[in-house]
């Protein structure tokens, strides 16, 4: 569209168009389906999904988690605080999703789809947020060194890290989904 020209090519549909909340809900469910596909490969490839040695690998990771103070749980629910937590958490997960990119053989495309669909979800949520100033973006230098550290781990730890990232991301999205449905 040339500058200053407000051309609207697609008319409003006859049936109700998707609302912001509906589309965000669908986007989260899309990512959750992607995580399930990736977890299937991880669990088939190794016995990580049944392992009890998770604490060993968990020490290296600082995966985002929902806490009471984030205002996303039913008790003490706070829409604005919670939305900031969801967006901040997703931004923090991005480095871990980058790590996953070379971790899958048969699901390479799915891993990319999970990464890209998370970026889209962040965009959708940022449009919904009123207090964007409260959202802290992770430091790129810190992320780069974390990525290097994770990639330097031995094979067992890398497999465990992959499993933990997927599990934590799934839990974070499920909590986000529940919270967003209250907004």
């Amino acid at each position: 569209v040339p500058p200053g020209e407000d051309s609207k090519d697609v008319a409003a549909p006859h049936r109700q168009p998707l609302t912001s909340s509906e589309r965000i809900d669908k986007q989260i469910r899309y990512i959750l389906d992607g995580i399930s596909a990736l977890r299937k490969e991880t669990c088939n490839k190794s016995n990580m999904c049944e392992s009890s040695k998770e604490a060993l690998a968990e020490n290296n990771l600082n995966l985002p988690k929902m806490a009471e103070k984030d205002g996303c749980f039913q008790s003490g629910f706070n829409e604005e605080t919670c939305l900031v937590k969801i967006i901040t958490g997703l931004l923090e997960f991005e480095v871990y999703l980058e790590y996953l990119q070379n971790r899958f053989e048969s699901s390479e495309e799915q891993a990319r789809a999970v990464q890209m669909s998370t970026k889209v979800l962040i965009q959708f949520l940022q449009k919904k947020a009123k207090n964007l100033d409260a959202i802290t973006t992770p430091d790129p230098t810190t992320n780069a060194s974390l990525l290097t550290k994770l990639q330097a781990q031995n094979q067992w730890l890398q497999d465990m890290t992959t499993h933990l990232i997927l599990r934590s991301f799934k839990e974070f999205l499920q909590s986000s989904l529940r919270a967003l449905r209250q907004m």
Partner: nanobody, 125 residues
Framework: SGGGLVQPGGSLRLSCAAS????????IGWFRQAPGKEREGVAC????????YYADSVKGRFTISRDNAKDTVYLQMNSLKPEDTAVYYC????????????????????????WGQGTQVTVSS
């Protein structure tokens, strides 16, 4: 919008915007229809993961992209040929909301709910 008359080998950029709903929430396809021919899907882009798909006839020459901040989808057409002459339509649908969707299905018109009015592209010397 953005159609017009262009010489063979030239370029054009088509834009698709919407009123009354958010384009960013939908999978978008570009279709074209030449006189006396069936409507043909040329390119599409997902709203879920931004993946793209192109018909063989335009691969390497056309590029579909979206700017969610501007709520607009573009079709960059390079190395245009006389056989690209047609009315070009953008369309919006929800074909991309299920993980693992078949990307090649997105150039089928039945996947779309909402259609633009079209813009004429003529490639001629």
């Amino acid at each position: 919008s953005g159609g017009g008359l262009v010489q063979p080998g030239g370029s054009l950029r088509l834009s698709c915007a919407a009123s009354g709903f958010t384009l960013a929430y939908y999978g978008i396809g570009w279709f074209r229809q030449a006189p006396g021919k069936e409507r043909e899907g040329v390119a599409c882009i997902s709203s879920s993961d931004l993946s793209t798909y192109y018909a063989d006839s335009v691969k390497g020459r056309f590029t579909i992209s979206r700017d969610n901040a501007k709520d607009t989808v573009y079709l960059q057409m390079n190395s245009l040929k006389p056989e690209d002459t047609a009315v070009y339509y953008c369309a919006a649908g929800t074909w991309d909301l299920k993980f693992g969707y078949s990307r090649s299905n997105c150039v089928r018109s039945y996947e779309y709910d909402y259609w633009g009015q079209g813009t004429q592209v003529t490639v001629s010397s």
